[in-house]
């Protein structure tokens, strides 16, 4: 009976340790509002354990509920800059496959120079997340000011 | 064969339940920008399970990737106060050992009176996290307005 | 001896996968500052796995430490609107049972149109969380702008 109980345990690999924290690589060409991300120990404190990068966008490898979080700071910014260039908006969404395209998280800068938020959302293997920064202001590439990550939470 | 499968399970203690949520104790003397934290059930809803406090700074006890989060609200503040006293900046970083010193998370208040953010970052046993509030404005000690915490996420 | 080791493993059901992500349903009548939430796959990307809704408020079903997060965006808002209607404040707290009533998380909008934050807090089975929006401005019901969730983290 104790032996049967052990079978209800959770195998290590099914714990879904999938997690990623990315730093900004670059912005896209004009007409492309996407931010392009990079990650890996050679770059500092960013990493990918499970998810992968596909041309700078984050692709999910395991179905489940994820905590998605982001912080974006504008590079040359004061409250007057931010309000004069309003609206500057950051949206995180599933951008492919097209059939699952949806905005998950959206924030405007108004008179601030940083946005930060997080949410729980179901994601499926193959979902690619895009982060769109609309407006004319550029994001800071400092790794403590601009970052984007996901953490698998449960099946 | 079923018995061998049980051996791939994850022992409870290796799940790394390390977690802490702290409330503001006090600010440092002038020329010391650090916030000093405290935690424990006698103080309300703050706690330390694994990490420890070392002279008001949070010390990590288990290697791993952590979710670090913080919210700081300024005590006497309006949007005009915040902009007049700009820059008021909050930075969370590893402050010791000196060889691992780095800024992990940085936000400015601009015309706002609260900053809140979170990020995933690798931390090692012995890392001490410091939270530096630069500028002349003082943080609120209300436990629902100012808090700082970490949560172990994976090895 | 290997068999005894297996008994220290963590059963799947005790991992406490309790998690919920809610979208705004409606605001209360005048004199009732509470936001009323809804969740479920039929509504989009919101869900309840463990916690339940009780008249639009979130009720906890499992003791433990939870990560509570929220984002609220005001519906018709600019930085001038927000400052003219100041103070507009969002508070998340335990509202029942009355003996455990406490504010967990509080933010003011000042000149911004979105607040977002998160914190770790102990919650007990039967705790009901309320989110109070005080002021005259109304929240957006867009699911990527206003959401509220909890995630069980540890016992």
């Amino acid at each position: 009976q104790r032996f049967a109980q052990a079978q209800q345990q959770l195998p290590l690999e099914s714990l879904g340790w999938d997690v990623a924290e990315l730093q900004l690589n670059h912005t896209g060409p004009q007409q492309d509002p996407r931010l392009y991300w990079q990650g890996g120990p050679a770059l500092g404190r960013s990493f990918l354990h499970g998810p992968e990068l596909d041309k700078g966008q984050l692709r999910i490898h395991r179905d489940g509920i994820y905590m998605v979080h982001i912080q974006v700071t504008l590079a040359i910014c004061s409250s007057t800059t931010a309000s004069r260039h309003h609206p500057t908006t950051l949206a995180v969404g599933i951008c492919s496959p097209a059939s699952r395209s949806i905005s998950l998280l959206r924030l405007s800068f108004h008179q601030g120079c940083t946005i930060a938020s997080q949410r729980l959302t179901p994601l499926a293997r193959g979902d690619t997340l895009c982060t769109n920064l609309t407006g004319t202001l550029l994001p800071s590439r400092n790794t403590d000011e601009t970052f984007f990550g996901v953490q698998w939470v449960r099946p | 064969q079923r018995f061998a499968q049980a051996q791939q399970q994850l022992p409870l203690e290796s799940l790394g339940w390390d977690v802490a949520e702290l409330q503001l104790n006090h600010t440092g003397p002038q020329q010391d920008p650090r916030l000093y934290w405290q935690g424990g059930p006698a103080l309300g809803r703050s706690f330390l399970h694994g990490p420890e406090l070392d002279k008001g700074q949070l010390r990590i006890h288990r290697d791993g990737i952590y979710m670090v989060h913080i919210q700081v609200t300024l005590a006497i503040c309006s949007s005009t106060t915040a902009s007049r006293h700009h820059p008021t900046t909050l930075a969370v970083g590893i402050c010791s050992p000196a060889s691992r010193s780095i800024s992990l998370l940085r936000l400015s208040f601009h015309q706002g009176c609260t900053i809140a953010s979170q990020r995933l970052t690798p931390l090692a046993r012995g890392d001490t996290l410091c939270t530096n509030l630069t500028g002349t404005l003082l943080p609120s000690r209300n436990t629902d307005e100012t808090f700082f915490g970490v949560q172990w996420v994976r090895p | 001896q290997r068999f005894a080791q297996a008994q220290q493993q963590l059963p799947l059901e005790s991992l406490g996968w309790d998690v919920a992500e809610l979208q705004l349903n409606h605001t209360g009548p005048q004199q009732d500052p509470r936001l009323y939430w809804q969740g479920g796959p039929a509504l989009g990307r919101s869900f309840l796995h463990g916690p339940e809704l009780d008249k639009g408020q979130l009720r906890i079903h499992r003791d433990g430490i939870y990560m509570v997060h929220i984002q609220v965006t005001l519906a018709i808002c600019s930085s001038t609107t927000a400052s003219r209607h100041h103070p507009t404040t969002l508070a998340v707290g335990i509202c029942s049972p009355a003996s455990r009533s406490i504010s967990l998380l509080r933010l003011s909008f000042h000149q911004g149109c979105t607040i977002a934050s998160q914190r770790l807090t102990p919650l007990a089975r039967g705790d009901t969380l309320c989110t109070n929006l005080t002021g005259t401005l109304l929240p957006s019901r867009n699911t990527d702008e206003t959401f509220f969730g909890v995630q069980w983290v540890r016992p």
Epitope: - | Q23, N25, H26, T27, G28, P29, Q30, D32, Q38, A42, L43, G44, T136, L138, R141, T143 | -
Partner: nanobody
């Protein structure tokens, strides 16, 4: 048990000055912050000035440059020097001391009336 008692309030003309004092009796220890609040009729209590154990001070926009908060070294007294008083400064003024352990000690309040 700690008790706080304010004094120094009264009636003063616009442009005048007052010095409020707040004396602490009882076993006072581990104080990390002292504050002055005020409450005008029909308004919420407003935080006016703060001083920390480290000596840092902050003031509300409405009083900055006119009011000065200070304390004695043992937290036995807290002071608020109010200069260039205006009719809108009329309120009941309360002193507050906060301990490390989040105990909040309050005085009963002293009335300040500024006539034009």
């Amino acid at each position: 048990q700690v008790q706080l008692q304010e004094s120094g309030g009264g009636l003063v003309q616009t442009g005048g000055s007052l010095r409020l004092s707040c004396t602490a009796s009882g076993s006072i220890f581990d104080i990390v912050r002292g504050s002055w609040y005020r409450q005008a009729p029909g308004n919420q209590r407003e935080l006016v000035a703060i001083i920390t154990s480290g000596g840092a001070t902050n003031y509300a926009d409405s009083v900055a440059g006119r009011f000065t908060i200070s304390r004695d070294s043992a937290w036995k007294a807290l002071y608020l020097q109010m200069n260039s008083l205006k009719p809108e400064d009329t309120a009941v003024y309360f002193c507050n001391m906060e301990s490390v352990r989040y105990r909040n000690y309050w005085g009963q309040g002293t009335q300040v009336t500024v006539s034009s």
